[in-house]
């Protein structure tokens, strides 16, 4: 199933394991999405030479993919759990438009691409519950997202392949950093 089981968020351990604790659901969800990304990267790397390309910078100029920085408080040095959790949620919300772009980019892994997208939506919900006491999270502007999507889809084939590769790579790195940070929370 695309989404691991679980019901209401619960931070204090209960005597029974249903529902899952929020920490366990978040951890499992991220690992599930990472597995999906690996499968998608495999298809991308098999059908093009993008994974070995040295021309990534050309395509990266057109993208504004979320990236963890020191100021976000998600690294061991300068760790700040509240700042970090806001960054993780904001970053995932920003990735949503790029995950939408990926939806028609795969042939044999079409279902996997959909599963990654839907599982990310569920992960955002889990994290928003965990962050219920934090300041409001800024959501991306739908109009800006729509125009970005149109722009990405209008690229030539080479740039679309490179964009797909870069989205998957960046999303993987973002999730790995998020997973490490969330384990402390």
């Amino acid at each position: 199933a695309p989404v691991p089981p679980g019901e209401d968020s619960k931070d204090v351990a209960a005597p029974h394991r249903q529902p899952l604790t929020s920490s366990e659901r978040i951890d499992k969800q991220i690992r599930y999405i990472l597995d999906g990304i690996s499968a998608l990267r495999k298809e991308t790397c098999n059908k093009s030479n993008m994974c070995e390309s040295s021309k990534e910078a050309l395509a990266e100029n057109n993208l504004n993919l979320p990236k963890m920085a020191e100021k976000d408080g998600c690294f061991q040095s300068g760790f700040n759990e509240e700042t970090c959790l806001v960054k993780i949620i904001t970053g995932l919300l920003e990735f949503e438009v790029y995950l939408e772009y990926l939806q028609n980019r795969f042939e044999s892994s079409e279902e996997q691409a959909r599963a990654v997208q839907m599982s990310t939506k569920v992960l955002i919900q889990f994290l928003q519950k965990k962050a219920k006491n934090l300041d409001a999270i800024t959501t991306p502007d739908p109009t800006t997202n729509a125009s970005l999507l149109t722009k990405l889809q209008a690229q030539n084939q080479w740039l679309q392949d490179m964009t797909t590769h870069l989205i998957l790579r960046s999303f993987k790195e973002f999730l790995q950093s998020s997973l490490r940070a969330l384990r402390q929370m």
């Epitope: 351990a13 366990e24 951890d27 300068g78 384990r183």
Partner: antibody, heavy 119, light 106 residues
Framework: EVQLVESGGGLVQPGGSLRLSCAAS????????MSWVRQAPGKGLEWVAK????????YYSDTVTGRFTISRDNAKNSLYLQMNSLRAEDTAVYYC????????????WGQGTTVTVSS | EIVLTQSPATLSLSPGERATLSCSAS?????MYWYQQKPGQAPRLLIY???NLASGIPARFSGSGSGTDFTLTISSLEPEDFAVYYC?????????FGGGTKVEIK
């Protein structure tokens, strides 16, 4: 040298309270989640509670929920466990433990402090 | 909560022999850890996330397994390895520990 030193243990009557402390040294304390784990005499290990690096999230075992409170003071590099409504079955050596950054493993442990609940 | 059962309770072996310790979980676990504890001392992390060797731990220690069945192997026992070994799991809170396996000198 990376070190955790517990203190505050002692003899207390059933229903009484005790506050344990754990002083961290040799590493930057603030990025690490911390836990308390206990070991009853001649028995195995039992996880008690965890606190996130900034103290925003706490987790407790079912046996201590509502009676024990975990807290920390990052400015003092210290972890605490406030234990109320103590019972005979809370008698144990209490260890504080650091969570390995980026993992759930408890990688550094103190030498423990003994809590005895008896009348 | 997840129950961990360790076997055997006691393992009597001689230095140089191979030790195989088992840990069985009541349901599938996300992460498994192994600790060594000597009398009067705090537990020491040996293995994390099923098979990763903790910092400063000799390569004769190794961990394996997934799901519900896990194994700690000590390839060739050294005199300092005689101690009690605990498995611990995390699959959400609470963390739980096995009852321990005592490795004693035969």
């Amino acid at each position: 040298e990376v070190q955790l030193v517990e203190s505050g243990g002692g003899l207390v009557q059933p229903g009484g309270s005790l506050r344990l402390s754990c002083a961290a040294s040799g590493f930057t304390f603030s990025p690490f989640a911390m836990s308390w784990v206990r070991q009853a005499p001649g028995k195995g290990l039992e996880w008690v509670a965890k606190i996130s690096p900034g103290g925003s999230w706490t987790y407790y075992s079912d046996t201590v929920t509502g009676r024990f409170t975990i807290s920390r003071d990052n400015a003092k590099n210290s972890l605490y466990l406030q234990m109320n409504s103590l019972r005979a079955e809370d008698t144990a050596v209490y260890y504080c433990a650091r969570q390995l950054w980026g993992y759930y493993a408890l990688d550094i442990w103190g030498q423990g402090t003994t809590v005895t609940v008896s009348s | 909560e997840i129950v961990l059962t360790q076997s055997p309770a006691t393992l009597s072996l001689s230095p140089g022999e191979r030790a195989t310790l088992s840990c069985s979980a009541s349901i599938s676990v996300s992460y498994m850890y192994w600790y060594q504890q000597k009398p009067g001392q705090a537990p020491r992390l040996l293995i994390y996330d099923m098979s990763n060797l903790a910092s400063g731990i000799p390569a004769r220690f190794s961990g394996s397994g997934s799901g519900t069945d896990f194994t700690l192997t000590i390839s060739s026992l050294e005199p300092e390895d005689f101690a009690v070994y605990y498995c611990m799991q995390w699959s959400g809170y609470p963390y739980t520990f096995g009852g321990g396996t005592k490795v004693e000198i035969k």
